[in-house]
């Protein structure tokens, strides 16, 4: 290799030395010099760092607040973060998940295209020609309507998107 | 206090493989590139290559490419060096060597500011 | 490739001497160069990195100088545990070469 033009990759310059940095789950106790070596600490209970750094503290590992329908989905470790996710029901409000809320329910006309998730909401659409949905419900697809052909009925009442048709029997008088 | 402990000595037939280890303590392995020289009997340096211990991505002098493999077990802080189809002009003591970096009027100088003790390498039918 | 000549291969001086190694490189490797220090059945040893550098834990009576093409190691008062031979290696152009070494004997 020609010269170096930077210290390594995992290294950082300081007082003319390209020191080691340390590696996740550490933090820097003291830089090297030309007579010692970087000299780096495990993080504590309760704290992690996630990358090759120089950091002399390490952060706190995330708090799922209980308050705000949050649990611990993965407990964190030295080099990785606590993940939170929401209670059931619940979904979180942003992609850190700091905070809950209710999934979303879909009025009558329309059906769930995708049940909620800890961290999407409940996606509704619209019941189509042939389907209908009767109640408000984060779970509840849009049904399609009954065929009365089927049951040797007929219909007497068209379905709606938000009503089932209804069928009567066939009218005997009829030729 | 930074140490490189390498493997005993081997004695091989041409033709053959020869696998030297070199154990690293004291300081980061993953970060200092580690380099491997050899020096035949009665004879001078020679540069074989290196490895970056932390991508496992090594670099060959051209003189030993194909025949040379640089490896490392960043668990056990090790890196390794596999010379194949020996011949008796392999014969020769091989070292693992750290890089330092110097950093010095707009510049960075290395140099290898570690080494370890040697591998003995006999090549004879 | 570089190629370094040190001269002179063999040198015979006393405890207390002073003594000069040069290095001549075949092209310029500006202050791209080392020195080391090996003694038989041992490893190699640094003494001088950047072309007049002093490693750590180095004596003092040991220096470099130099740069381009030509670079020097001096011994300023040559001490009993200075009979060894020195290398000096550029680091300046792959791939990085050893110069063919000085022995530094007892007169």
């Known amino acids: 290799p020609e010269p170096p033009t930077a210290c390594r990759e995992k290294q950082y310059l300081i007082n003319s030395q390209c020191c080691s940095l340390c590696q996740p789950g550490q933090k820097l106790v003291s830089d090297c010099t030309e007579f010692t070596e970087t000299e780096c600490l495990p993080c504590g209970e309760s704290e992690f760092l996630d990358t090759w750094n120089r950091e002399t503290h390490c952060h706190q590992h995330k708090y799922c607040d209980p308050n705000l329908g949050l649990r611990v989905q993965q407990k964190g470790t030295s080099e990785t973060d606590t993940i939170c996710t929401c209670e059931e029901g619940w979904h979180c409000t942003s992609e850190a998940c700091e905070s809950c809320v209710l999934h979303r329910s879909c009025s009558p006309g329309f059906g769930v295209k995708q049940i909620a998730t800890g961290v999407s909401d409940t996606i509704c659409e619209p019941c189509p020609v042939g389907f209908f949905s009767n109640v408000s419900s984060a779970f509840e697809k849009c049904h399609p309507w009954t065929s009365c052909e089927t049951k040797d009925l007929v219909v007497q009442q068209a379905g709606t998107n938000k009503t089932d048709v209804v069928c009567g029997p066939q009218d005997r008088l009829r030729a | 206090q930074v140490q490189l402990v390498q493997s005993g000595a081997e004695v091989k037939k041409p033709g053959a493989s020869v696998k030297v280890s070199c154990k690293a303590s004291?300081?980061?392995?993953?970060?200092?590139?580690m380099y491997w020289v050899r020096q035949a009997p009665g004879q001078g340096l020679e540069w074989m290559g290196w490895?970056?211990?932390?991508?496992?991505?090594?670099t060959y002098a051209q003189k030993f490419q194909g025949r040379v493999t640089m490896t490392r077990d960043t668990s056990i802080s090790t890196a390794y060096m596999e010379l194949s189809r020996l011949r008796s002009d392999d014969t020769a003591v091989y070292y693992c060597?750290?890089?330092?970096?110097?950093?010095?009027?707009?510049?960075?100088?290395?140099?290898?500011?570690?080494w370890g003790q040697g591998t003995l390498v006999t090549v004879s039918s | 490739d570089i190629q370094l000549t040190q001269s002179p291969s063999f040198l015979s001086a006393s405890v207390g001497d002073r003594v000069t190694i040069t290095c001549r490189a075949s092209?310029?490797?500006?202050?791209?160069l080392a020195w080391y220090q090996q003694k038989p059945g041992k490893a190699p040893k640094l003494l001088i990195y950047?072309?007049?550098t002093l490693q750590s834990g180095v004596p003092s009576r040991f220096s470099g100088s130099g740069s381009g093409t030509e670079f020097t190691l001096t011994i300023s008062s040559l001490q009993p545990e200075d009979f060894a031979t020195y290398y000096c290696?550029?680091?300046?152009?792959?791939?990085?070469?050893f110069g063919q070494g000085t022995k530094v004997e007892i007169k």
């Open positions: 490895i970056n211990p932390d991508s496992g991505a090594p």
């Open positions: 092209q310029g490797i500006s202050s791209y």
């Open positions: 060597a750290r890089e330092k970096i110097y950093y010095g009027s707009g510049n960075y100088y290395p140099s290898f500011d570690y």
């Open positions: 950047a072309a007049s």
């Open positions: 004291g300081y980061t392995f993953a970060g200092y590139y």
């Open positions: 290696q550029q680091l300046g152009s792959y791939p990085w070469t």
